[in-house]
C-alpha cells in the first residue's frame, strides 16, 4: 500500500503586509492522500474555531486537492504575528506558517523635556517611523525650519513579535535662542502624527 502524503502550497504570500483595519485572506492549497482528517489554524497557541473554511477542489472520490482559507478581518496592530495552518491524515502531518505584519500609523508615546535640556520624542508604528524635528519662532503655526536630532535610537518593543517598532529621537533645546514651538513629527508609509512643545508653556501633544 502506498504511503500517504500531504503537500501544502500557499496561494498567497507567506509574508503578508496589511494595513491597520483591513482584511486579509490566508489561503493554502494542499494535496492529501489519504483524505485529510484534521485541519486547524493557530495563532499564538490559540486555535481558531471559526473565521476559516476548508473545501475540496472537486467532489470526485479521486480528488486529492483541497483549499483552506483563514479570513482575518479588520486587523489591529496587535494582531500581527505567525499564523499556522496544520493538516493531518492517517499517515502524515504537515504545516505552513504565514508571517503577518500590520502596518500602523505612528503613535507618539512620550514627548519630554529632559533635565539636561534635551527634548525627547518616542514614537511607535510599523513600518518603523521616522522622526523629524521642526522649530517655529514666536506664535507661528507652521513649523518649517528643520532641526537635526542629536540622537536617534530604535528601541526594543515589549509587545509581541511583528508588533510596532519604537523609535526615540532627541534634540538639544539649548540651540533655540527665541521663544517658539518645536514640532516632533513621526511618519511612515501609513501616516503621520505630530506633537508640539511650546517654550512658553508646558508641553502639549496633538495627534494629527
Amino acid at each position: 500500500v502506498d504511503k500517504g502524503f500531504i503537500n501544502i502550497f500557499p496561494m498567497i504570500n507567506t509574508t503578508v503586509f496589511v494595513n491597520d483595519g483591513e482584511n486579509v485572506d490566508l489561503i493554502v492549497e494542499y494535496e492529501a492522500f489519504p483524505k485529510p482528517e484534521h485541519q486547524q489554524w493557530i495563532y499564538m497557541n490559540r486555535t481558531f474555531t471559526d473565521k476559516w473554511e476548508d473545501y475540496p477542489k472537486s467532489e470526485n472520490e479521486s480528488n486529492i486537492r483541497y483549499v483552506s482559507e483563514l479570513h482575518l478581518t479588520r486587523l489591529k496592530g496587535t494582531e500581527g504575528g505567525t499564523y499556522t495552518f496544520l493538516v493531518s491524515n492517517s499517515d502524515v502531518n504537515a504545516a505552513i506558517a504565514f508571517n503577518v505584519y500590520v502596518n500602523t500609523k505612528p503613535e507618539i508615546l512620550t514627548y519630554d523635556r529632559l533635565v539636561n535640556g534635551m527634548l525627547q520624542c518616542v514614537a511607535a508604528g510599523f513600518p518603523e517611523p521616522t522622526i523629524d524635528w521642526y522649530f517655529c519662532p514666536g506664535t507661528e503655526q507652521r513649523c518649517s525650519a528643520s532641526v537635526l536630532p542629536v540622537d536617534v535610537q530604535t528601541l526594543n518593543s515589549s509587545g509581541p513579535p511583528f508588533g510596532k517598532l519604537v523609535v526615540q529621537s532627541s534634540i538639544d533645546s539649548s540651540a533655540f535662542k527665541h521663544n517658539g514651538t518645536v514640532e516632533c513629527k513621526a511618519y511612515n508609509d501609513v501616516g503621520k502624527t505630530s506633537a508640539y512643545f511650546n517654550f512658553a508653556f508646558k508641553e502639549q501633544i496633538h495627534p494629527h
Partner: antibody
Framework: EVQLLESGGGLVQPGGSLRLSCAAS????????MAWVRQAPGKGLEWVSV????????PYADSVKGRFTISRDNSKNTLYLQMNSLRAEDTAMYYC??????????WGQGTTVTVSS | DIQMTQSPSSLSASVGDRVAITCRAS??????LNWYQQKPGKAPKLLIY???KLEDGVPSRFSGSGTGTDFTLTIRSLQPEDFASYFC??????????FGPGTKVEIK
C-alpha cells in the same frame, strides 16, 4: 454537472434597487465560498464581493461598499446580491462564481444590469 | 490596490501559431496569478492558477509562467477554439483581487 445560473437582472433607474440570485447545482454549495464579479460593456472584469461558506465573512470592493449586500441561503443552494442606490457605472454583466483559493473556478453565464433613466 | 496590465491588448494569429500574452503587476505578487479565457457572450473560464498550475480539463497546449511582477500565458499551437479574450487576475491581495484589462486573440 457543476452549474451556476444567475437571474434578477434588468433595467433600473439611478437610485433604484435590484436583487440578483444565483442558483447552484452539481456540488455541495454549503462547502464553498462564492463571489460576484461584474463586467461593464466592452470592459474588463471587476470583483464585487465574496462570501464565505457559512456566510459570516463578506468583504466588498470599495466601489460598492455600503450599497451592495451579498448573502446566501445554503438550504436553497442560492447566492444573492442585493444592490441599492444603483448608479450608471453599475451597468454591467454580473457573474456569480465559485471561489477556489484566490480565483474562481466555476462561473455562471451572467445576468445583465442596466442603470439608466 | 495592485494594478494589472496586459500586453498586447489584441493580437492576430493563425491556427498552429505559438502565442504569448504577458501580464504585469504594479508590485510583486510572487506566483499568485490566475489566467482566464472568455469567448464573446460567454462567462470566463479558469485556465491557469498559481501562475503555472493547469486547471482540470484545460488542454496541455496552455501553459503559464512567471513570478514577481511579470507573467506569461503561452498557447503552444493555437486552435480554432482558442480565439477569445484572455484575462489575468492577481490573488496576492485577497480578498481585494484585481483583473488585467484583457488581451483579445483574433484570427489573422
Amino acid at each position: 454537472e457543476v452549474q451556476l445560473l444567475e437571474s434578477g437582472g434588468g433595467l433600473v433607474q439611478p437610485g433604484g434597487s435590484l436583487r440578483l440570485s444565483c442558483a447552484a447545482s452539481g456540488f455541495t454549495f454549503s462547502s464553498y465560498p462564492m463571489a460576484w464579479v461584474r463586467q461593464a460593456p466592452g470592459k474588463g472584469l471587476e470583483w464585487v464581493s465574496v462570501i464565505s461558506s457559512s456566510g459570516g465573512y463578506t468583504p466588498y470592493a470599495d466601489s460598492v461598499k455600503g450599497r451592495f449586500t451579498i448573502s446566501r441561503d445554503n438550504s436553497k443552494n442560492t447566492l444573492y446580491l442585493q444592490m441599492n442606490s444603483l448608479r450608471a457605472e453599475d451597468t454591467a454583466m454580473y457573474y456569480c462564481a465559485r471561489r477556489y483559493g484566490g480565483g474562481m473556478d466555476v462561473w455562471g453565464q451572467g445576468t445583465t444590469v442596466t442603470v439608466s433613466s | 490596490d495592485i494594478q494589472m496590465t496586459q500586453s498586447p491588448s489584441s493580437l492576430s494569429a493563425s491556427v498552429g501559431d505559438r502565442v504569448a500574452i504577458t501580464c504585469r503587476a504594479s508590485q510583486s505578487i510572487d506566483t499568485y496569478l490566475n489566467w482566464y479565457q472568455q469567448k464573446p457572450g460567454k462567462a470566463p473560464k479558469l485556465l491557469i492558477y498559481a501562475a503555472s498550475k493547469l486547471e482540470d480539463g484545460v488542454p496541455s497546449r496552455f501553459s503559464g509562467s512567471g513570478t514577481g511582477t511579470d507573467f506569461t500565458l503561452t498557447i503552444r499551437s493555437l486552435q480554432p477554439e482558442d480565439f477569445a479574450s484572455y484575462f489575468c487576475q492577481q490573488s496576492y491581495s485577497s480578498p481585494g483581487i484585481t483583473f488585467g484589462p484583457g488581451t483579445k486573440v483574433e484570427i489573422k
